[in-house]
């Protein structure tokens, strides 16, 4: 494919006109989300709000400048950022002795890029250097893709409900997606 997405810490992220990029889950005020009918977006309809811990797989639009060293694109490009979780928790608490273990109640999915598109951008460089053309690879759509324990050894998926057994030396995930008894979650749509 050979496309390179130029992006560094200096990249300027500009919310697209009419778009309101939501903060990452840990920054979200989890009392502002609502029921499934509103798909996890800020409530524009009078549905009952709920405390939530998870969010649907969303395509957030961002407009940014492409940078490469000292050079910057003449115009900003608009791309998608895949954000959120896919569906309800699929880790369940499993108390064994004094410790708390997590075991899966279904496969784990992650919100990741699905398709990409190529866009040619013109980079302007300081000091009178000639503009350079670059092709950048931008996310075009997102999907909820299956994640296995082999992809990430920190995923606690080494035992299932039909073969539950404690794993020595394992710790539960930080901010695990476990389902706590009275913890409501966002109803997602894929």
């Amino acid at each position: 494919q050979g496309w390179q997405a130029f992006k560094n810490d200096a990249t300027e992220i500009i919310p697209e006109l009419g778009e309101y990029p939501e903060p990452p889950p840990e920054l979200e005020n989890n009392k502002t989300m609502n029921r499934a009918e509103n798909g996890g977006r800020p409530p524009h309809h009078p549905f009952e709000t709920k405390d939530v811990s998870e969010y649907s797989c969303r395509e957030l639009h961002f407009t940014r400048y492409v940078t490469d060293g000292q050079c910057r694109s003449a115009k900003p490009v608009t791309e998608l950022v895949c954000s959120g979780q896919c569906g309800p928790a699929r880790l369940l608490p499993n108390a064994i002795g004094r410790g708390k273990w997590w075991r899966p109640s279904g496969p784990d999915f992650r919100c990741i890029p699905d398709r990409y598109r190529a866009q040619r951008v013109q980079l302007l460089c300081p000091g009178g250097a000639a503009p350079r053309a670059r092709k950048v690879r931008l996310v075009a759509s997102c999907k909820c893709k299956r994640l296995t324990r082999f992809h990430n050894q920190s995923e606690l998926k080494d035992f299932g409900p039909e073969a539950a057994r404690p794993q020595k030396g394992r710790k539960p995930r930080p901010r695990a997606r476990g389902a706590k008894a009275n913890q409501a979650e966002l109803e997602n749509a894929y």
Epitope: V52, G87, D158, E185
Partner: antibody
Framework: EVQLVQSGAEVKKPGASVKVSCKAS????????MHWVRQAPGQGLEWMGE????????GYNQKFKGRVTMTTDTSTSTAYMELRSLRSDDTAVYYC????????????????WGQGTTVTVSS | DIQMTQSPSSLSASVGDRVTITCRAS??????LNWYQQKPGKAPKLLIY???RLLSGVPSRFSGSGSGTDFTLTISSLQPEDFATYYC?????????FGGGTKVEIK
Amino acid sequence: EVQLVQSGAEVKKPGASVKVSCKASGYTFTDYNMHWVRQAPGQGLEWMGEINPNSGGAGYNQKFKGRVTMTTDTSTSTAYMELRSLRSDDTAVYYCARLGYDDIYDDWYFHVWGQGTTVTVSS
Amino acid sequence: DIQMTQSPSSLSASVGDRVTITCRASQDISNYLNWYQQKPGKAPKLLIYHTSRLLSGVPSRFSGSGSGTDFTLTISSLQPEDFATYYCQQGDTLPYTFGGGTKVEIK
């Protein structure tokens, strides 16, 4: 024996709602998410969504978003699927289903199915 | 959504025949492919999961193969109880999707 027993057939008018129940037995209800799958007459299978019985969190197929609500009652080990604003093309058999797991292959599959609930939408 | 295309949609065969059903995914689904058998008026029953793993209790005449986008269910010697409709299902990407089904009829 693991079993999922569903409520009886329903006949509804267009625009109405239907609520199908699925009572689980033979396993710990809160150990597995419950899924719902439907099948229109002479057609294939269509996954509608799933719910986590512990938290009440649900995930739905985008096709049904806004019309479907899945809930559970852990005290009776029962899952419910409500479909609103019914149309004639919602006429189908609705199944609840529970996943099974193979920890060697880290894979999941629809292992246990309810007997199905026929919902007919007709004016 | 990932489209699952089964072929043929129906076939006629005799007891003892070798039957092959194919399932093609619109994008790579690794080995997350399951096969189900359904008889009229009944719920589907799992036969094979993870492309080729036979569920306990399923006769060994059923086998599955493939990876990526192309998968096959084979019945090595068709038995009277095998006349049914067969569905493939992908578990790689949400929403889960099923093939349109292949009806195996008596010739």
